[in-house]
Interface confidence: low
């Protein structure tokens, strides 16, 4: 908008760094062959690289990644009763980020 | 995966609350009639509701919203020179969140 600038603070760039994001645990991560169950919790927090860089030729990319296994509950409904099982989902957290050229291969840690 | 649970911590739900997200300032927000310019900064941080609720009939929604005008730079290249102008973009920050039934209308504050 082209409104009055009187109370507008200068916009600060969202720098390239890790931020907390919400990751939805899809049922396919637990069991691809069966859809008759629920997952608890349905979503968890992960650390992910986000933000923008000084020009379009570079992107905010993770330079260090950590895999984090977490235990979830697989809730099957058998004859109208919940059956609780345990499953492990491996989450990916980004530990460090960098503005890298788009062509550069993503490092694996 | 249903692998070994030895080092798996219990997954904690990503509760419904405000988190810092990255908002890309699209050029359309500044000028819909012209594409021959850049915007600086290209992205900013905003506060947004995210997370999940106890069942599928409810969603994490903002209960309090604040509009925040910020000053950005519109950078036009005119006869090979960068012309720096000011424009105001109004960002939307979520101040408070709640798990609300899907049918409920979103509040305006």
């Amino acid at each position: 908008s082209l409104g009055s600038l009187t109370i507008a603070e200068p916009a600060m760039i969202a720098e390239c760094k890790t931020r907390t994001e919400v990751f939805e645990i899809s049922r396919r991560l637990i069991d691809r062959t069966n859809a008759n169950f629920l997952v608890w919790p349905p979503c968890v927090e992960v650390q992910r690289c986000s933000g923008c860089c000084n020009n379009r030729n570079v992107q905010c990319r993770p330079t260090q990644v950590q895999l984090r296994p977490v235990q979830v509950r697989k809730i099957e409904i058998v004859r109208k009763k919940p059956i609780f099982k345990k499953a492990t989902v491996t989450l990916e957290d980004h530990l460090a980020c960098k503005c890298e050229t788009v062509a550069a291969a993503r490092p694996v840690t | 995966s249903l692998g070994s649970l030895t080092i798996a911590e219990p997954a904690m739900i990503a509760e419904c609350k405000t988190r810092t997200e990255v908002f890309e300032i699209s050029r359309r927000l500044i000028d819909r009639t012209n594409a021959n310019f850049l915007v600086w900064p290209p992205c900013v941080e905003v506060q947004r509701c995210s997370g999940c609720c106890n069942n599928r009939n409810v969603q994490c929604r903002p209960t309090q919203v604040q509009l925040r005008p910020v000053q950005v730079r519109k950078i036009e290249i005119v006869r090979k020179k960068p012309i720096f102008k000011k424009a105001t973009v109004t960002l939307e920050d979520h101040l408070a969140c709640k798990c609300e039934t899907v049918a409920a209308a979103r509040p305006v504050t």
Epitope: L5 | V78, R79, K81, P82, I83, K85, K86, A87
Partner: antibody, heavy 122, light 110 residues
């Protein structure tokens, strides 16, 4: 250290052409975003912008004086030349050259010469 | 073409007092460009004081500050020192980088 120095005639007759030279040091007019401008100031009056020349040889002129002004540069000599045709007594002023940058918020003259006084009289 | 109107024409103040100089930008251009301020003492070339509305130029003491947006811009000298008495000019530009100076404000000793 950035310095600029103006040189040219102190006295010009009406209808004649004024030629002023700005010799500078401490920066290069081939550097991206760099420019040199001319500004004048009649005795006891305000500053008036005349012209700019940029690193890529782009030239800008005060619209009200455009048809009388010509600006040029010699990058190897670190010089900028301004010519002003059809001089009139109202053109009597101190003429300054100054460096200008077009970097982000900057469209201002950050370094100035000491100025040269030009009198137009018969 | 933009027009910059400075007020007051003359400001009579004593050392130690606060000086507030105004520069009003009138233009049909809906996009605002940045304003700079210069100080000029008798017999000397102008000196850049403020650029980009509110950025102090190199070597300028922090008693000088610039502010404003839209059409109204202000140069403030929080406590006048003897060396601050001079003429001050605001300057801006338009889309074609046609540069305009204001008419000046003289800050004189009361």
């Amino acid at each position: 250290e950035v310095t600029l120095r103006e040189s040219g005639p102190a006295l010009v007759k009406p209808t004649q052409t004024l030629t002023l030279t700005c010799t500078f040091s401490g920066f290069s007019l081939s550097t991206y975003g760099m420019g040199v401008g001319w500004i004048r100031q009649p005795p006891g009056k305000a500053l008036e912008w005349l012209a700019n020349i940029w690193w890529d040889d782009d030239k800008y002129y005060n619209p009200s004086l455009k048809n009388r002004l010509t600006i040029s540069k010699d990058t190897s000599k670190n010089q900028v030349v301004l010519t002003m045709t059809n001089m009139d007594p109202v053109d009597t002023a101190t003429y300054y050259c100054a460096r200008i940058e077009s970097v982000w918020t900057r469209y201002d003259f950050d370094y100035w010469g000491q100025g040269t006084m030009v009198t137009v009289s018969s | 073409e933009i027009v910059l109107t400075q007020s007051p024409g003359t400001l009579s103040l004593s050392p130690g007092e606060r000086a507030t100089l105004s520069c009003e930008r009138s233009s049909g251009d809906i996009w605002q460009t940045y304003v700079s301020w210069y100080q000029q003492k008798p017999g000397q070339a102008p000196r850049l004081v403020i650029y980009g509305d509110d950025q102090r130029a190199s070597g300028i003491p922090d008693r000088f500050s610039g502010s404003g947006s839209g059409t109204d811009f202000t140069l403030t000298i929080s406590r006048l020192e003897p060396e601050d008495f001079a003429v001050y000019y605001c300057q801006s530009y338009d889309i074609d980088i046609d540069i305009t100076f204001g008419g000046g404000t003289k800050v004189e000793i009361k």
